[in-house]
Amino acid sequence: SGRGEAETRECIYYNANWELERTNQSGLERCEGEQDKRLHCYASWRNSSGTIELVKKGCWLDDFNCYDRQECVATEENPQVYFCCCEGNFCNERFTHLPEAGGPEVTYEPPPTAPT
């Protein structure tokens, strides 16, 4: 697109509410949007006493909060639902919480996939 940003075409997809909403639980999402809009990946999760509960992952539409972010980093101190977004294919596979106010960085890695 000629603007120097990482182009996002595919993101990791996840929906914890997949049964109720009758969607796939996980997979890949191909991002589609208007030509003049940038596309990003996002991840959202809860942290209950150190236990990470994934909520949603997927494509996210043009949002300056996501511009030029190669990694998915949530910066809110202690939200009910953490949110991060990034640019680049599958950049939402790993996600991190790094509060702006300082504090420990916590990175969440996807579990290793079983060999096929």
Epitope: E21, T23, E32, G33, Y42, C59, W60, N65, P79
Partner: antibody, heavy 120, light 107 residues
Framework: EVQLLESGGGLVQPGGSLRLSCAAS????????MSWVRQAPGKGLEWVSA????????YYADSVKGRFTISRDNSKNTLYLQMNSLRAEDTAVYYC?????????????WGQGTLVTVSS | DIQMTQSPSSLSASVGDRVTITCRAS??????LNWYQQKPGKAPKLLIY???TLQSGVPSRFSGSGSGTDFTLTISSLQPEDFATYYC?????????FGGGTKVEIK
């Protein structure tokens, strides 16, 4: 031009049926989730029903579940809402709306609305 | 279901005023929060999606802020064409739900 155009509204008696249509143009209809949203006279907006791009997933508000059926014909770029067992409280302007593909899934394109009046 | 509560339900303001409308969700909707404008007899129009991103063609006097459960729509300098009803909406989960609306009237 991206456009949605509803039709099929009108006056119907309680217990009656009506089918609304929404003709889409200017975008790849089959790749977009679509919804029906209604607005009773002088009231706010109420989401009624949604359908995925393929038509494989359908969702309904509790107030219409079992009475309304959403469907789509991607070959005709048309969305439908079959309304049965209509009640006075279903009286409203019905809008079809496109739910933009990537998150956060806002309703970015709306039709002009069609009025459904349920009265004896 | 997630309940969306808007306040005030109506307000009177003059051209040039700064107007603030608030929206509260009954549980976190993360960044899945959108704002619409509706004029009498017309369909709603998307103003802001994802809390703060202006839809194409929307004037920069409109802005959105907030996080989690508490959100704000601000019109920095009210213009004659801004007198309308404004709705927030969550798209975090089904069913999609709207706030009750805020009618902005001429003082």
């Amino acid at each position: 031009e991206v456009q949605l155009l509803e039709s099929g509204g009108g006056l119907v008696q309680p217990g009656g049926s009506l089918r609304l249509s929404c003709a889409a143009s200017g975008f790849t209809f089959s790749s977009q989730g679509m919804s029906w949203v209604r607005q009773a006279p002088g009231k706010g907006l109420e989401w009624v029903s949604a359908i995925s791009g393929s038509g494989g997933s359908r969702y309904y508000a509790d107030s219409v579940k079992g009475r309304f059926t959403i469907s789509r014909d991607n070959s005709k770029n048309t969305l439908y809402l079959q309304m049965n067992s209509l009640r006075a409280e279903d009286t409203a302007v019905y809008y079809c709306a496109r739910e933009q593909g990537p998150g956060p899934y806002a309703f970015d394109i709306w039709g002009q609305g069609t009025l459904v009046t349920v009265s004896s | 279901d997630i309940q969306m509560t808007q306040s005030p339900s109506s307000l009177s303001a003059s051209v040039g005023d700064r107007v603030t409308i608030t929206c509260r969700a009954s549980q976190s909707v993360s960044r899945f929060l959108n704002w619409y404008q509706q004029k009498p007899g017309k369909a709603p129009k998307l103003l802001i999606y994802g809390i703060s991103t202006l839809q194409s063609g929307v004037p920069s006097r409109f802005s959105g802020s907030g996080s989690g459960t508490d959100f704000t729509l601000t019109i920095s300098s009210l213009q004659p064409e801004d007198f309308a009803t404004y709705y927030c909406q969550q798209s975090f989960s089904l069913p999609r739900t709207f706030g009750g609306g805020t009618k902005v009237e001429i003082k």
